[in-house]
Structures are given as C-alpha cells and as structure tokens.
C-alpha cells in the first residue's frame, strides 16, 4: 500500500477538516508552550502544502515522510530555544531520532495557567461569531495540556463541545443548559486522557507484547463469542492504532482507527451482537461507541478450561512450539469466561500460568507438576476481591471526600517524599473510584475498580518520572505493569522517612479561602492534611481526624466572621498550637 506522497494519501483519506484538526493537535502536543496563533499559522502552511501534493504527488518534497515534513515545520519556530531550551537540540537530529527526541520532551505537567471558564454569554458570543476558531482553540488548549490525548477521540470531544454550544447558546437559560455539559465533558476528557496515558506508558515502557496482552484480555471480555483469530486481528490492528497515536503519528492513527471501525462493523456477526447501534453512527461517534461497547453475552457451550490447559497431554508441546500463540489463546479463553475479572488480574493469572509451565515443562513429570496450577490462582483472585470489598466498605462509610482523605493519609505515609500536590491529585483521583465503581453490580465491580486504579497509579508514575524522589515509587512503577497496583497496596509506612520540619506558612490561611469553590476548599484542606502527615508521620487516623475536624470548624467560623482576615490571623495560630498538642 505504498503511496508516492504520504501527506497527500492522508489528506485524501481524512478530508481537509480532520486533517487540519489532527495536525493542530499534533503540533500542540509537541510544542505545548507555543501561542495558538503560531500553531494556526503552521497548520495552514502544512495544509496548503498538502493540497499541492494532492494535485501532484510528484511535486517537490511531497515524497517526504510525515515526520520529516512536520519536524521541519516545527523547527522553523523562531523562539524554540528560548521557549523550550534543550528541546531545540532535537532539530539538529535526523529522522527518526528527531521525532523520538520531540516525544521525550512531551511534558505531562506543563507549566500552563489553569483554564479559566469565561462567562456563558462571552463564550456563546465567541462561538457564534468565530465558530471555527473557537473549536480549534478547544483542541489546542486540551492537546497542549494533555500531550498524549488520543487524537481521534479528541476530535469526537470537540464535536460534543460544538453540539453543547449549538444547543445551549439558543436556550432560554444558557448557563443551566451549558455548564453541566461542559463539566461532564471536562471530567470525561480527563478520564479519557488518563486512560490513554496508561496505554502509551504500557507501549513505551513495557513494549508491544505487554500492550497486546492487555488488549487480548479486554477484547476477549468484550467479544466472548468471537474466535481467537478474530480477536487476534482486532488486537493487532488496535495495537497499530495506539502505537501510532502514542508515537505522534496522529494522521496514520486516525486513518487506521477508521479502518478498524469499518472492519468491525463489516464483521459484526463474527465479533459481537452489541455492535449494531454503534455501527449506524457517523465516523467519530462510531469509533467512540465501539471503544466503549458493553460486553457481549458469553457463549453457553464453553468447555472447562482445564481440558486444554491442565488435562491435555500436549500442554508442554503446544507451549514450546508457539509460546506467544499458546499464551495468547490461554489469555483469550480465560478472559472470555471472566468478564467479572479485571484485565490486570487476567494478565497476572496468565503470567502465573506461564511461570508454572516454564517450571514444570522442564521436569520429568510435567503433568504432576502443573496439575494444581489453577488452585494456585486462588490467592491472586482473592487479592483484588478483598481490595474491592475493603475499599467500597470504606467509601460507603465515609463518602467520597473523607475516603479521599483516608487514601491521602495512607499514600502519604507510604511515599512521603512525593510532592504534596501530586499526592493530593492522585489521592483525590483514587478516591473517585468509590463514586465510579462501588455502585456497580458485583460482576462489574472488580474490573471497574482495579482497572481504574491502574489508570490513576499510572498518573502517579508519569508525574514521578519527571522528578523522581522515591525509590519505592520507581520500583512499583517500573518492575511490572500488571503488578503496579498490588505493589503500591503492599507498601507499608516508610519507616526511613525523617519528618518534615514544621513550616508555619504551610498552615497559614487567609480570607480568600472563603471565596473558593467547594472543590478548591477541599484541595486546600487536603494539602494541609498531607503536610501534617509529612510533619507527623506517626500520627494515628484518630488524631488526624480530630485535627481535620478542628480545621473545618476553623474555616467555617472565620468565613462567617465580619472581619474574615482578622479571624484567620487570630484563630490560625491557635489551631496550629492545638494541632501540635493533639498530635504530640
């Protein structure tokens, strides 16, 4: 499928609108600090060039790779050295090293101002007067803050963003219509970004085999009626799509994702009975829908797994002859029978089974050695079951905010070297698992809980990688993808940690606290809580609870006072003194 001009090929496949949007996303994810107007200029130049190649594929430079074309364009930015420092050195390299260099400079936590939402009327006016610029600004702002956002999915979000404004800017009460929709889009966007970040981390840190294994588990759970060949085909294509997107090849990624959606819809009968509705939708919605489709019903006639994987006399022969295929089939067969297990658990079971075969197939009596292999799975299964039970009980007892606090204390004691903002952000996200998963029926709880926790812990891993401060975090993040969550769960209080010196400034609050939203107030309180634990790592939960209750009462009291600032100034030191006593 060789094309004389790759850029012309993608322009024709994707159409001008999607082409421009994807190039904008790609550039925004690479050059996260560049102003919007600069990016628009670059995108327009690339688009005009692409059009000349569509007209004549043999025209000058049209035969160049997309990386070469895009990299050359990025390297024309005048302020590259001043804005990005050593990222400018990438421009001295040749492809493919240059693109690898750009990828390594992607920043998961760029130093950008928080997005402030303008008044509804201001947004509606901007939308109605300059719709195209308004939507492109959305793509730009999201992409630069989330440099691994799944690009074709971001186009879907932009479509939903546009629909929200189209509907609500005509409504009687624009705010009541629009704001909940924007909140929902923001939350869904953050979730989508975090999920994709795990996929990219999986590919980049643990390789294609790890990603394929995870995909086999998920696809098999979703399409239990599909045969192994079909699952393998979908997994191979899916791996290509995500490898491309994670590698910055957004045009190829979007094109291949559309191809995969087409394939799935043309082969519904051999994949799943749940695809019909998705396949009736237009492209972006169709792909989104297929990615989130519910699990199909399990076939009724599935035979016992032990037949092929324990009882068969050919287990070692089959394993030896084609290790990856045999293990892929095991994972497929186990996963399609267990929609109630998390993908990570299924991968742990496959790893345990593989280790047992490595051990037993070497011996003179392999069958005698691996006969009880399925019994060895029990503790692996019970671990996430207990995790779900324990944490959902805590969530139901405390509610989300106090459950987040419980997790914040737990994780601050485990890894006190990690920065407080990171601990707060990660613990808040970990705590959301309760709201998201604990209301689910029993059969859906474990996959919801554990796979969500994997996504959140990956956020901790990527943030920590930027500035590593804890060997324990590094160890849990790098040793094994599937065992990250059990690794973090198993961490005890770090006894080697020297308590942080008391800093009065950390515990000094002002009247501006009263004007903060509920969420912002929670973050302030949780920041204080983490700092408190770092100062007194031996404090018990009861002691911390007392201090936090006193703190909440202090904020409430001062926010009701006539002279709020005076109240904070006067009562603050008293609170600090009382806390010191309570924690002594």
């Amino acid at each position: 499928d060789a094309h004389k001009s790759e850029v012309a090929h993608r322009f024709k496949d994707l159409g001008e609108e999607h082409f421009k949007d994807l190039v904008l996303v790609a550039f925004s994810q690479y050059l996260q600090q560049c102003p919007f107007e600069e990016h628009l200029k670059l995108v327009n130049e690339v688009t005009e060039f692409a059009k000349t190649c569509v007209a004549d594929e043999t025209a000058e430079n049209c035969d160049k790779s997309l990386h070469t074309l895009f990299g050359d364009k990025l390297c024309t930015v005048a302020t590259l050295r001043e804005t990005y420092g050593d990222m400018a050195d990438c421009c001295a390299k040749q492809e493919p090293e240059r693109n690898e260099c750009f990828l390594q400079h992607k920043d998961d936590k760029p130093d950008l101002p928080p997005l402030v939402r303008p008044e509804v009327d201001v947004m509606c006016t901007a939308f109605q007067e300059h719709e195209d610029t308004f939507l492109k600004k959305y793509l730009y702002e999201v992409a630069r803050r989330h440099p691994y956002f799944y690009a074709p999915e971001l186009l879907f979000f932009a479509q939903k963003y546009k629909a929200a404004f189209t509907e609500c800017c005509q409504a009687a009460d624009k705010g009541a219509c629009l704001l909940p929709k924007l909140d929902e889009l923001r939350d869904q966007g953050k979730a989508s970004s975090a999920k994709q970040r795990l996929k990219c981390a999986s590919l980049q840190k643990f390789g294609e085999r790890a990603f394929k294994a995870w995909s086999v588990a998920r696809v098999s759970q979703r399409f239990p009626k599909a045969d192994f060949t079909e699952v393998t085909k979908v997994v191979t294509d899916l791996t290509k799509v995500h490898t491309e997107c994670c590698h910055g090849d957004l045009l190829e990624c979007a094109d291949d994702r559309a191809e995969l959606a087409k394939y799935m819809c043309e082969n519904q009968d051999s994949l799943s009975s749940k695809l019909k509705e998705c396949c009736e939708k237009p492209l972006l919605e169709k792909s989104h829908c297929l990615a989130h489709v519910e699990n199909d019903e399990m076939p009724a006639d599935l035979h016992a797994l032990t037949d092929d994987y324990v009882e068969s006399k050919d287990v070692c022969k089959n394993y030896a002859e084609a290790k990856d295929v045999f293990m892929g089939m095991f994972l497929y067969e186990y996963s399609r029978r267990h929609p109630d297990y998390s993908a990570m658990l299924l991968l742990r079971l496959a790893k345990a089974y593989e280790a047992t075969l490595e051990k037993c197939c070497a011996t003179a009596d392999p069958h005698g050695c691996y006969a009880k292999v399925f019994d060895e799975f029990q503790p692996l299964v019970e671990d996430p079951q207990n995790l779900v039970k324990h944490n959902c009980e805590l969530f139901e007892q405390f509610g989300e905010y106090k459950f987040q606090n419980e997790l914040l204390v737990r994780y601050t004691k485990k890894v006190p070297q990690v920065s407080t903002p990171t601990l707060v952000e990660v613990s808040r996200n970990l705590g959301k698992v309760g709201t998201k998963c604990c209301k689910q029926p029993e059969a859906k709880r474990m996959p919801c809980v554990e796979d969500y926790l994997s996504v959140v812990l990956n956020q901790l891993c990527v943030l920590h990688e930027k500035t590593p401060v804890s060997d324990r975090v590094t160890k849990c993040c790098t040793e094994s993808l599937v065992n990250r969550r059990p690794c973090f769960s198993a961490l005890e209080v770090d006894e080697t940690y020297l308590p942080k010196a008391f800093n009065a400034e950390t515990f000094t609050f002002h009247a501006d606290m009263c004007t903060l939203s509920e969420k912002e107030q929670q973050v302030k309180k949780q920041t204080a809580l983490a700092e408190l634990v770092k100062h007194k790592p031996k404090a018990t939960n009861e002691q911390l609870k007392t201090v936090m209750e006193d703190f909440a009462a202090f904020v409430e009291k001062c926010c009701k006072a006539d002279d709020k600032e005076a109240c904070f100034a006067e009562e603050g030191p008293k609170l600090v003194a009382a806390s010191e006593t309570a924690l002594a």
Epitope: E354, E358, K359, T363
Partner: antibody
C-alpha cells in the same frame, strides 16, 4: 548484553563451607527462569549439580548433592547462590552456572565462565 | 538415576571426515537430550537440543538424531575448529535426571 557471572570460588579446607554467587545481567529473574549449576573437576567431565526456578524458588538436585549443597535465589539482586557445606577434596572443580534455553528446557544455551573451588588442607 | 553412557570416550579423525558419537540413556527420556562442545578453558557450548534441533549460530554440519534411549551426534565434514570434547546430556530438570555423558575427546589423527 545477556550474561551470567560466577564468583565466590577459592581455597577452602576440607569440612569447610563456601557460597558461590551467579549474577545475571541483561535479563530479569522476575520473568521466571531455571538457573542451574554444573561442575567440572580438573581434567574430568561435566557433572550436573542442580537447578533453581527463579519464579518460586523450586529446586532440584543431583542425588549426590542432596543434603550438602543448597541452591537459592534473590530476585531483587538477580542472583542465584550455591551454598556448599562439608566440602571434600573431590568437590574441587570449576563451578559453572547456566541458563537453559527458554520456552521448555532443552539444554543450556547461556553459561558463565566458571569459578574455581579448591578443597585442600 | 538416569545414566548417560557416551561412546567412544576418545576419537581421532581428519579434517573432512564424517564423525559420529553416540549416547545411550539408561531409561527412556523421549527426545530430551542435548549435545555440547567444550574447548579447554571455556564453558560448554550448546550444539543440539531436543535430540535433533540445531542451536542458534551452530553450523549445519552438526546434526543430532534419536529418541527414547539412543541418541547420535554427527559432524558431516570435520573442520579444524571442531576438535574439542563433546558431551551429551539428559535435559530433564529433576532429581533423578540432568546427567551428562562422560564425554568424547575428538583429536586430530
């Protein structure tokens, strides 16, 4: 580069003890491998001592080695050990550690250079 | 315990000769045998595994055959670098297995 390096050999008196180490690099024990010890007395043939499975620590020994020799592993250090007790003159040999061909044990494709143990008074 | 009896214990031959070494297991071991080459001062090098499969990087003049109890290593056309000692091994990891043959020293005639 994938390799095994033995250490800990030397001169020891009869009845004494010695612990040999086999450090792996280029691959991780956490992926589960068999690591075996083989010895060779000066001018003699190869003699299988035993093996450990890095996954769960399962061990097998040649019948003559049982009781006196113990094989263990420390996955965090990517190292396998051979603890030898009640040493005799006939234990004098070069001790090699080796890894079988992965995917079903077919023979040992990765060997260390060996470490010499001399048992003498 | 399985015993691997290798013969001959020594053998002299010339460059270009076809050489055969045999190994007999004291009990049936399926195709679980391997052959190694060892030169002085070096660790052994795997030549053949699973009775007949050529290990990675080994020249095709080496071949293995046999199953059950009788196994053979053949060098079709001896090269100068092939003069060394050869060992067979039962490749089960088990307390009663893992034994090597006594070795065959191949020298220049």
């Amino acid at each position: 580069e994938v390799q095994l390096v033995e250490s800990g050999g030397g001169l020891v008196q009869p009845g004494g003890s010695l612990r040999l180490s086999c450090a792996a690099s280029g691959f991780s024990f956490s992926s589960s491998y068999w690591i075996c010890w083989v010895r060779q007395a000066p001018g003699k043939g190869l003699e299988w001592v035993g093996c450990v499975f890095t996954g769960d620590g399962t061990t097998y020994y040649a019948s003559w080695a049982k009781g006196r020799f113990t094989i263990s592993r420390d996955n965090s250090k990517n190292t396998v050990y051979l603890q030898m007790n009640s040493l005799r003159a006939e234990d004098t040999a070069t001790y090699f550690c080796a890894r079988p061909v992965s995917v079903y044990y077919y023979g040992m494709d990765l060997w260390g250079q060996g470490t010499l143990v001399t048992v003498s008074s | 315990d399985v015993v691997m009896t290798q013969s001959p214990s020594s053998l002299s031959a010339s460059v270009g000769d076809r050489v055969t070494i045999t190994c007999q297991a004291s009990q049936i071991i399926s195709s679980r045998s391997a052959w190694y080459q060892q030169k002085p001062g070096q660790p052994p090098k795997l030549l053949i595994y699973q009775a007949s499969k050529l290990a990675s990087g080994v020249p095709s003049r080496f071949s293995g055959s046999g199953s059950g109890t009788d196994f053979t290593l053949t060098i079709s056309s001896l090269q100068p670098e092939d003069f060394a000692t050869y060992y067979c091994q039962c490749t089960y990891i088990d307390s009663n297995f893992g034994a090597f043959g006594g070795g065959t020293k191949l020298t220049v005639l």
